[in-house]
């Protein structure tokens, strides 16, 4: 894969570590709580994307071909983004009009545009079907939502951190 | 494993009150939320309220919207339900449920259960 197919990798950086922050003033989980629990068992009960270890999301992996993990994160900020389009999140109760949900959603689209190659076909993506949730339902969704998310953000700003350090090609000083 | 254990559950007449009661078995569980469901005879299990610890929002089924209220003690994961003028139509089994805080949405929403306690509102 050519060269000129890689992000700019300091840009995703900055954008995801900025999705992080957004994604936690979103939902800071009480103190109590057990952050980002995730069960093991969870991945085969729902079709959300997850990174994995097969996704070439490690070091060496990003060297010798950046696009199957950029791929992978491609997906999960599109899973998300419709998941933040849902009733789930527009739904009554309303969230307060000061919420970071506007600007998580924002940026959610903007790192998925500049991870979006402009020759690049847009990719059919199996998206999660929401029976229409009830009221009491969706405190609860989002909770599980939002903490699913910061959980994807946080590793997929471990990629960009590195894919910044180590795959930013260097400037070349002009004569 | 924890267990969630109800109580308060009986036998009480139209118009009067009835308090519930749940707490987990496992004093070290924290919840991010919990509830009540309960299940007539023939009928499927409904929402009745919630609480969700981090803000205290409340939330209720319509049909117990003014006559029940839900509440809690979050360090000691009990929670409530007081229960007001009763109908016959709230005789039903009373669940108490609590979500740990799990990020799986497709599943239950709630993974934790009690066994139940028994309301009969005679007319």
């Known amino acids: 894969v050519p060269r000129s197919s890689s992000p700019d990798w300091a840009q995703c950086q900055q954008l995801s570590r900025n999705l992080c922050m957004l994604a936690w003033n979103a939902h800071a989980p009480a103190g109590h709580m057990n952050l980002l629990r995730e069960e093991e068992d969870e991945e085969t009960k729902n079709n959300v994307p997850r990174i994995q270890c097969e996704d070439g999301c490690d070091p060496q992996g990003l060297k010798d071909n950046s696009q199957f993990c950029l791929q992978r994160i491609r997906q999960g900020l599109a899973f998300y983004k419709h998941l933040l389009d849902s009733d789930i999140f527009k739904g009554e109760p309303a969230l307060l009009p000061d919420s970071p949900m506007e600007q998580l959603h924002t940026s959610l689209l903007g790192l998925s545009q500049l991870l979006q190659p402009e020759d690049h076909p847009r990719e059919t993506q199996q998206m999660p079907s929401l029976s229409s949730s009830q009221q009491w339902q969706r405190p609860l969704l989002r909770s599980k939502i939002l903490r699913s998310l910061q959980a994807f953000l946080a590793i997929a700003a471990r990629v960009f951190a590195h894919g910044a350090a180590t795959l930013t090609e260097p400037l070349v000083p002009t004569a | 494993e924890v267990q969630l254990v109800e109580s308060g559950g009986g036998l009480v007449q139209a118009g009067g009150s009835l308090r519930l009661s749940c707490a987990a078995s496992?004093?070290?569980?924290?919840?991010?939320?919990m509830a009540w469901f309960r299940q007539a005879p023939g009928k499927e299990r409904e929402f009745v309220a919630q609480?969700?610890?981090?803000?205290?929002?409340?939330y209720y089924a319509d049909s117990v919207k003014g006559r029940f209220t839900i509440s809690g003690d979050n360090a000691k994961n009990t929670v409530y339900l007081q229960m007001n003028r009763l109908k016959p139509e709230d005789t039903a089994v009373y669940y108490c449920?609590?979500?740990?805080?799990?990020?799986?949405?497709?599943?239950?929403?709630?993974?934790?259960w009690g066994q139940g306690t028994q309301v009969t509102v005679s007319s």
């Open positions: 609480i969700i610890w981090s803000g205290g929002s409340t």
């Open positions: 449920a609590a979500d740990s805080g799990r990020t799986d949405w497709t599943a239950d929403l709630y993974d934790y």
């Open positions: 496992d004093r070290t569980f924290s919840s991010y939320a």
